[in-house]
């Protein structure tokens, strides 16, 4: 059984629900940002397309002592079917622009949205 | 305690040519990659250049590519930014970077001014 209410034992998270989860979690970030997001901090953008949430991870990752984005790196660790390290790209990821990590959050999000509107959950 | 101090800005015509310099303490400079980023007046922050620990790596802004070079000393725990056929658009306050940290562990910046 999966978890219903709280009362059944807890089983996998539909990709569904995890993929919701992670956009709330994105939306909350956004509509909480008072000082820039993780003091201005800047990534590599990724293509968002094949293997997304594993170059997100790689992106994010590599960003420490920003506890906003700690929940969101935890997140998308459970979508990426390989264990992500700080320094670590997979050849998927051209490293061609860095942005800063509040940008980063808010394409992230805005593709997100669209894929859950899709009933794209993988 | 991290500290980064940039030198180097100046005003420099069109075309011209500008080095800017990094001295990097407080943290082993050789272990981590480093940013360029810059900022425009009344602008936000863009990113200009990134280089890989070791030198051999590095990345450029497609704004840049081809004029500026991006370079590193660890043994001066130096990194520097050669800028070539400034343009005006250039004009900004750039800022070296530990990479993917805040400014809280950014240098203060040394303005460059592209103008004739």
């Known amino acids: 059984l999966t978890c219903l209410g709280g009362f059944a034992s807890p089983g996998p998270v539909p990709p569904s629900t995890a993929l919701r989860e992670l956009i709330e979690e994105l939306v909350n970030i956004t509509q909480n940002q008072k000082a820039p997001l993780c003091n201005g901090s800047m990534v590599w953008s990724i293509n968002l397309t094949a293997g997304m949430y594993c170059a997100a991870l790689e992106s994010l990752i590599n960003v420490s002592g920003c506890s906003a984005i700690e929940k969101t790196q935890r997140m998308l660790s459970g979508f990426c079917p390989h264990k992500v390290s700080a320094g670590q790209f997979s050849s998927l990821h051209v490293r061609d622009t860095k942005i800063e990590v509040a940008q980063f959050v808010k394409d992230l999000l805005l593709h997100l949205k669209k894929l859950f509107r899709e009933g794209q959950f993988n | 305690e991290v500290q980064l101090l940039e030198s180097g800005g100046g005003l420099v015509q069109p075309g011209g040519s500008l080095r800017l310099s990094c001295a990097a303490s407080?943290?082993?400079?050789?272990?981590?990659?480093m940013d360029w980023v810059r900022q425009a007046p009344g602008k936000g922050l863009e990113w200009v250049s990134s280089i890989g620990p070791s030198g051999s790596e590095t990345w450029y802004a497609d704004s840049v590519k081809g004029r500026f070079t991006i370079s590193r000393d660890n043994s001066k725990n130096t990194l520097y930014l050669q800028m070539n056929s400034l343009r005006a658009e250039d004009t900004a306050v750039y800022y070296c970077?530990?990479?993917?940290?805040?400014?809280?562990?950014w240098g203060q910046g040394t303005l460059v001014t592209v103008s004739s």
């Open positions: 970077a530990k990479a993917y940290t805040g400014f809280g562990y």
């Open positions: 407080g943290f082993t400079f050789r272990d981590y990659e």
